[in-house]
């Protein structure tokens, strides 16, 4: 994906993220030279968070609320750089891109990983899922690959039908673009595919984190 805009407001932090940050700072003060065993540290953090009272968590929740307000305030005045329009128009009626075999696998096992390791960051959950997938024998991957292939087939039929009808957005604007070469089009679609999957996973994780905060 493109390089981030340095002027873009920093993303908002959850109450748990503030708590972990505080944990890290405490750990650094106590053991300035010690290297952190990430999984042990995450485990301890999440155990501590689970045993904390609502009153103790309150401080971090206040920090998260303040940070959310800061983020919303900054986003109101933030102007994205030229060419970085929020996202190219996506017709909500367009067929949804099919997930890859790995994405199907992740959807199946992400809840388990997140549930058993509540302190793991989104990146580390993804890393763990990647390890699980890589350690999976080829014949164990087959059901996911079969399902992904079926969904891809269905998508290709649906997208062909959708294109035959003509994109409503293009029709409205009267835009007539020369057909890109099939190869280029497919490459772009694959790239978009991966971006969509990553975005969907991030959105899912963010939603789940917010749900966790509500608990």
């Amino acid at each position: 994906m493109g390089k981030g805009d340095p002027k873009k407001p920093r993303g908002k932090m959850s109450s748990y993220a503030f708590f972990v940050q505080t944990c890290r700072e405490e750990h650094k003060k106590k053991h300035p030279d010690a290297s952190v065993n990430f999984s042990e540290f995450s485990k301890k953090c999440s155990e501590r968070w689970k045993t904390m009272s609502a009153k103790e968590k309150g401080k971090f929740e206040d920090m998260a609320k303040a940070d959310k307000a800061r983020y919303e305030r900054e986003m109101k005045t933030y102007i994205p750089p030229k060419g970085e329009t929020k996202k190219k128009f996506k017709d909500p009626n367009a067929p949804k891109r099919p997930p890859s075999a790995f994405f199907l696998f992740c959807s199946e096992y992400r809840p388990k990983i997140k549930g058993e390791h509540p302190g793991l960051s989104i990146g580390d959950v993804a890393k763990k899922l990647g390890e699980m997938w890589n350690n999976t024998a080829a014949d164990d991957k087959q059901p996911y690959e079969k399902k992904a292939a079926k969904l891809k087939e269905k998508y290709e039929k649906d997208i062909a039908a959708y294109r035959a009808k003509g994109k409503p957005d293009a029709a409205k604007k009267g835009v007539v673009k020369a057909e890109k070469s099939k190869k280029k089009k497919e490459e772009e679609e694959d790239e978009e595919d991966e971006e969509d999957e990553e975005e969907e996973e991030d959105e899912e994780d963010e939603d789940e984190e917010e749900d966790d905060d509500d608990e």
Epitope: P111, G115, H117, A137, D139, Y144, K147
Partner: antibody
Framework: EVQLLESGGGLVQPGGSLRLSCAAS????????MTWVRQAPGKGLEWVSS????????KYADSVKGRFTISRDNSKNTLYLQMNSLRAEDTAVYYC??????????WGKGTTVTVSS | DIQMTQSPGTLSLSPGEGATLSCRAS???????LAWYQQKPGQAPRLLIY???KRATGTPARFSGSGSGTDFTLSISSLEPEDFAVYYC???????????FGQGTKVEVK
Amino acid sequence: EVQLLESGGGLVQPGGSLRLSCAASGFTFSWYDMTWVRQAPGKGLEWVSSISPSGGYTKYADSVKGRFTISRDNSKNTLYLQMNSLRAEDTAVYYCTTEFYDYLDVWGKGTTVTVSS
Amino acid sequence: DIQMTQSPGTLSLSPGEGATLSCRASQSVSSTYLAWYQQKPGQAPRLLIYEASKRATGTPARFSGSGSGTDFTLSISSLEPEDFAVYYCQHRHNWPPQWTFGQGTKVEVK
């Protein structure tokens, strides 16, 4: 406390059907793969079938393929095994089991299925 | 399909003695997917060792697992009365699981 409780076993005639259930409690059922393992009298352990957390993916031992169907109802925290065209060799204690992190397996006490005329 | 063969079928030993149980796979398997179970009469199996050599929660230190490729071993350094049981090796495929068990080794009192 994590618990798995099998039920539905009994005496059935060859060619008959039976549906086993396994009620789970004490853990988030919808996160985990679930598995049926059986043990014929005086014999060893035999893996029967497994199902993924969402229920979207299943696997079967060759000996039961086409006759047994594994399913789950995550809203009821229950695992099922529908057994059709039962044979004498399906006589066994059927265990329901799941596996947590670090391979900590949890097993039920088992339910006995007897196929006999 | 991978077959798991255990030997001996029965092991007659006295408390305090050491025990060595063998498990052979019909083709090379990753140690990540090799486990050992203990089963006592009338009880469900209990996981002892996973990933060929890691002790599961609650497994006493006298139990140890080793091996790689096709040959794996479960060792009991000094048998306690509660260790007399049947032991199964297991090869596991995951997501969702598919398990292959050996036929078992019975450890009985001599």
